[in-house]
C-alpha cells in the first residue's frame, strides 16, 4: 500500500503508482494542483478498502479515466472527483 502524507515540501505523495485501479474499488479521487509548496500535480485515490494510493498523473489509465469523467461532467459522476488545494 502506498503511503500518503504531508512532507516538509507540503507534497502529500511520497511514492506514486501507475497501475490501473478498477472503478469498483475506488471511493473517490482527489486532484491537488501544483502550488502551495508542492511543485507537482498530485492525484490521490481513496479506495473502498480504506487504503489510499497516489497515482502518477502521467499514468495512461488515469489520464484516460479523467478524460471519460470530463466528458460525463454534465451528469452524475460514477466516481466523485474532488479538486482542491491544500490549505
Amino acid at each position: 500500500v502506498l503511503e500518503v502524507y504531508y512532507t516538509s515540501l507540503r507534497c502529500r505523495c511520497v511514492q506514486e503508482s501507475s497501475v490501473f485501479i478498477p472503478r469498483r474499488f475506488i471511493d473517490r479521487i482527489q486532484i491537488l494542483p501544483r502550488g502551495n509548496g508542492c511543485p507537482r500535480k498530485e492525484i490521490i485515490v481513496w479506495k473502498k478498502n480504506k487504503s489510499i494510493v497516489c497515482v502518477d498523473p502521467q499514468a495512461e489509465w488515469i489520464q484516460r479515466m479523467m478524460e471519460v469523467l470530463r466528458k460525463r461532467s454534465s451528469s452524475t459522476l460514477p466516481v466523485p472527483v474532488f479538486k482542491r488545494k491544500i490549505p
Epitope: V1, R24, K47
Partner: antibody
C-alpha cells in the same frame, strides 16, 4: 505460503444443489475480495462471482445470478458458492481466487479447483 | 458485457521464437487487462496485470502492452516450459470476462 483449497464438488443430478467451499490460509482473508471462476471440460475460463470483505459489494455473471450465491465467513477464512437448479452446462472445475485490491487489482492467487459434474 | 476476442486460438512455434497473442475488447477497458498462463490440469497463473506489468517472479521474456481496446501479449524467446494455454481477461468492469484462450504448442 498462500493456499486456497476448494471442496464440495461432486456428482449431482440436474435440478440439484451443491455448496462449494474454499478454505484460505497464509493470507489475511478478511482484507481481500474473492472470486469464483469456472472452466467447463476442454473450454475456457468463465468468471462466476466476486465478493468484497464486508460482503456489501457482490457481483455475478448475469447468466448465473439467479441460481448461484456467493458468500464468505471471515472468521472461518472461508468462501462459499451455493449453486441451485444445476444444469448439465454447469459441469466444470470451479476455482476460487483472491482478488487483490491493494496494488495489482487482479486475481493473483488461485486454488487447484473442485470438479462439479451435473448428470443424470 | 465486454467481449474479449483473443487470437489466434492456437499456434505452433519453435523454441527461441518470438510469440505474439492479441486480445481485442468490445469496448474501451482502459488498461484493465491481465494475462494468465494455464497448464493442463492446473490452475491459471497470473503473468501480466494492468496490461503491461509483470507479476512477481514472472520471467522477463513475458511482456504485455496496449490500452483501450487492443492488447498484445509477447513471449520474446519461447522456452519448452512455456507450453500452455494463455488467456487475456478484462477487469475494467463486471462481469469480468476472459478471452477464449490461445493454446501454444512446440513445433
Amino acid at each position: 505460503e498462500v493456499q486456497l483449497v476448494e471442496s464440495g464438488g461432486g456428482l449431482v443430478q440436474p435440478g440439484g444443489s451443491l455448496r462449494l467451499s474454499c478454505a484460505a490460509s497464509g493470507i489475511d482473508f478478511s482484507r481481500y475480495w474473492m472470486s469464483w471462476v469456472r472452466q467447463a471440460p476442454g473450454k475456457g475460463l468463465e468468471w462466476v462471482a466476486e465478493i468484497n470483505p464486508e460482503r456489501n459489494y457482490i457481483n455475478y455473471a448475469p447468466s448465473l445470478k439467479d441460481r448461484f450465491t456467493i458468500s464468505r465467513d471471515n472468521a472461518k477464512n472461508s468462501l462459499y458458492l451455493q449453486m441451485n437448479s444445476l444444469r448439465a452446462e454447469d459441469t466444470a472445475v470451479y476455482y476460487c481466487a483472491r482478488q487483490d485490491d491493494y496494488d495489482k487489482y487482479a486475481m493473483d492467487y488461485w486454488g487447484q479447483g473442485t470438479t462439479v459434474t451435473v448428470s443424470s | 458485457d465486454i467481449q474479449m476476442t483473443q487470437s489466434p486460438s492456437s499456434l505452433s512455434a519453435s523454441v527461441g521464437d518470438r510469440v505474439t497473442i492479441t486480445c481485442k475488447a468490445s469496448q474501451d477497458v482502459n488498461t484493465g487487462v491481465t494475462w494468465y498462463q494455464q497448464k493442463p490440469g492446473k490452475a491459471p497463473k497470473l503473468l501480466i496485470y494492468s496490461a503491461s506489468y509483470r507479476y512477481t517472479g514472472v520471467p522477463s521474456r513475458f511482456s504485455g502492452s496496449g490500452s483501450g481496446t487492443d492488447f498484445t501479449f509477447t513471449i520474446s524467446s519461447l522456452q519448452p516450459e512455456d507450453i500452455a494455454t494463455y488467456y487475456c481477461q478484462q477487469y475494467y468492469s463486471t462481469p469480468l470476462t476472459f478471452g477464449g484462450g490461445t493454446k501454444l504448442e512446440i513445433k
